[in-house]
Interface confidence: low
């Protein structure tokens, strides 16, 4: 018996061929011997089966001795043995219809679980293998689960259902809702304007929700909410903002925040959360601000950084075009009695300069000491 696999909602064509290459009488029946369709000369006739409005054939092929049964908009319950009677012969075809669906929604938050459920006809024992967009394979029977979805899981999942050594392929588009970056760091000199951007790693027609930026300043004992906002159809509106600092927010996506000036008291770490309508859970992105200040006070030239710096970062003070006078893995360096000229304060990581601040030291004219 020939086995054909079909997909729920698709169209399937079951073939039936006569040895005579001409139009002769044929009938398609189901396993209960109920007629589905057949011919009366050149006319298509239909029987009382449940497939009545979804069954068809190709009259153009009858003259070649081909009498296909076409079933549209397949349902799981269409799984059956179909019998083609032609030339005193009976051809049997077993049709097995499968459906594969994602649990609840195909738009899932990063870290959530994806469950794929296979609908299959009674008596079948299929296995399923799915390949994620990043090339990872998962196998299962009636259900497959993937926990802790990552950004790279966004895209088309290709799932293959195997039954009786036959295969049928499903494609399911999954969108993982996440920010493009889990974390970012901004380096600024004191007084400079700071731009924070929070691009999303997905696009959807309508995006509605609410968000908040909590900030833990390095100098502060506790964190505080800097801004809260609403998102309606990709339009951003600020609900509440602190007086210090007075953040500004862009009205369109990507989410964009401007801090008028970088000050040591603002250096620290923030966590932007975004709660999306009809989704349980929130999207998170961490953002860090490092602020540098170079100052000259009497005979002391000092360079300091505030904020979350890694222990391997190097802070240096050097006179322009000369070797570094002082270089330490610390958050403050200084030079006593600096020479006149343009001094540079550099924050670097393995030789790559992350932040630079220049300060001009003027010559000091000392008066001669009296004898």
């Amino acid at each position: 018996k020939k086995v054909v696999l079909g997909k729920k909602g698709d169209t399937v064509e079951l073939t039936c061929t006569a040895s005579q290459k001409k139009s002769i009488q044929f009938h398609w029946k189901n396993s209960n011997q109920i007629k589905i369709l057949g011919n009366q000369g050149s006319f298509l006739t239909k029987g009382p089966s449940k497939l009545n409005d979804r069954a068809d054939s190709r009259r153009s092929l009858w003259d070649q001795g081909n009498f296909p049964l076409i079933i549209k908009n397949l349902k799981i319950e269409d799984s059956d043995t179909y019998i083609c009677e032609v030339e005193d012969q009976k051809e049997e075809v077993q049709l097995l219809v499968f459906g594969l669906t994602a649990n609840s929604d195909t738009h899932l938050l990063q870290g959530q679980s994806l469950t794929l459920t296979l609908e299959s006809p009674p008596g079948s024992s299929p296995s399923v293998q799915c390949r994620s967009p990043r090339g990872k394979n998962i196998q299962g029977g009636k259900t497959l689960s993937v926990s802790q979805l990552e950004l790279q899981d966004s895209g088309t999942w290709t799932c293959t259902v195997l039954q009786n050594q036959k295969k049928v392929e499903f494609k399911i588009d999954i969108v993982v809702l996440a920010f493009q970056k889990a974390s970012s760091i901004v380096y600024k000199k004191e007084g400079e304007q700071v731009e924070f951007s929070f691009p999303l790693a997905f696009t959807v027609e309508k995006l509605t929700g609410s968000g908040e930026l909590w900030w833990q300043a390095e100098r502060a004992s506790s964190s505080k909410s800097w801004i809260t906002f609403d998102l309606k159809n990709k339009e951003v509106s600020v609900k509440r903002v602190t007086q210090d600092p007075k953040l500004q927010m862009g009205k369109k996506l990507p989410l964009h925040l401007t801090l008028p000036q970088a000050l040591p008291q603002y250096a620290g770490s923030g966590n932007l959360t975004l709660a999306l309508e009809a989704k349980t859970g929130k999207l998170h992105q961490e953002v860090n601000l490092v602020v540098m200040r170079a100052t000259q006070l009497q005979k002391n030239l000092t360079c300091e950084v505030w904020g979350p710096t890694s222990p391997k970062l190097m802070l240096s003070l050097k006179l322009e075009n000369k070797e570094a006078k002082v270089s330490k893995r610390e958050k403050a360096v200084w030079v006593l009695n600096p020479e006149a000229g343009m001094w540079q304060c550099l924050l670097s990581d393995s030789g790559q300069v992350l932040l630079e601040s220049n300060i001009k030291v003027l010559p000091t004219w000392s008066t001669p000491v009296q004898p």
Epitope: L5, Q129, P133, R134, E169
Partner: antibody, heavy 118, light 107 residues
Framework: EVQLQQSGPELVKPGDSVKMSCKAS????????MDWVKQSHGKSLEWIGY????????NNNQKFKGKATLTVDKSSSTAYMELHSLTSEDSAVYYC???????????WGQGTLVTVSS | DILLTQSPAILSVSPGERVSFSCRAS??????ILWYQQRTNGSPRLLIK???ESISGIPSRFSGSGSGTDFTLSINSVESEDIADYYC?????????FGGGTKLEMK
């Protein structure tokens, strides 16, 4: 050893059709997709579509809808591609390539050169 | 359709050098990228699948990296037999698409 043997070069007139073949050996023909790829002279590669020999299911690149018809003959483990209403734009090398579920185009035929000229 | 942009168009190297080919996708595609080598008058040959997975029979000097939208194929010590065109291809969604290719030349 997996082998894909393609038919020889074709010189055809504009407006005509051409049917090329790709005979597979060294593996179970019905277990893998057979894809077809176009490469115009000095240009990159373009995916035309695939056929799944097990059930004859096809999926074509929209760009080649109506241009390419993919078929198979399971008894001879051969895949066919017929190109219709040929123009000079269709002059190219056409490759068949075997694709599994967890790999790219791991095996390629040697290519069939089609030249459309009056 | 997903557009794959390869750069540079031509790379000139000396034997023994390390070389890297870049491929950028127009949208996030996870690690669904494959790399092929095509020598003059030859058929393409699969080098790397799913961005970084090696293919049996391919020399270990070929490696791949990247995810999301930016991908790299590297040859850590170029040999004369590596002179060829190199193509990336995405298998994330239909239609499958190829990059425009990078030609590797010897100085």
């Amino acid at each position: 050893e997996v082998q894909l043997q393609q038919s020889g070069p074709e010189l055809v007139k504009p407006g005509d059709s051409v049917k090329m073949s790709c005979k597979a050996s060294g593996y179970t023909f019905t277990d893998y997709f057979m894809d077809w790829v176009k490469q115009s002279h000095g240009k990159s590669l373009e995916w035309i579509g695939y056929i799944y020999p097990n059930n004859g299911g096809t999926n074509n690149n929209q760009k080649f809808k109506g241009k390419a018809t993919l078929t198979v003959d399971k008894s001879s483990s051969t895949a066919y591609m017929e190109l219709h209403s040929l123009t000079s734009e269709d002059s190219a090398v056409y490759y068949c390539a075997r694709r599994g579920y967890d790999e790219g185009f791991a095996y390629w035929g040697q290519g069939t050169l089609v030249t459309v000229s009056s | 359709d997903i557009l794959l942009t390869q750069s540079p168009a031509i790379l000139s190297v000396s034997p023994g050098e390390r070389v890297s080919f870049s491929c950028r996708a127009s949208q996030i595609i996870g690690t669904s990228i494959l790399w092929y080598q095509q020598r003059t008058n030859g058929s393409p040959r699969l080098l790397i699948k799913y961005a970084s997975e090696s293919i049996s029979g391919i020399p270990s000097r070929f490696s791949g990296s990247g995810s999301g939208t930016d991908f790299t194929l590297s040859i850590n010590s170029v040999e004369s037999e590596d002179i060829a065109d190199y193509y990336c291809q995405q298998s994330n969604t239909w239609p499958f698409t190829f990059g425009g290719g990078t030609k590797l030349e010897m100085k």
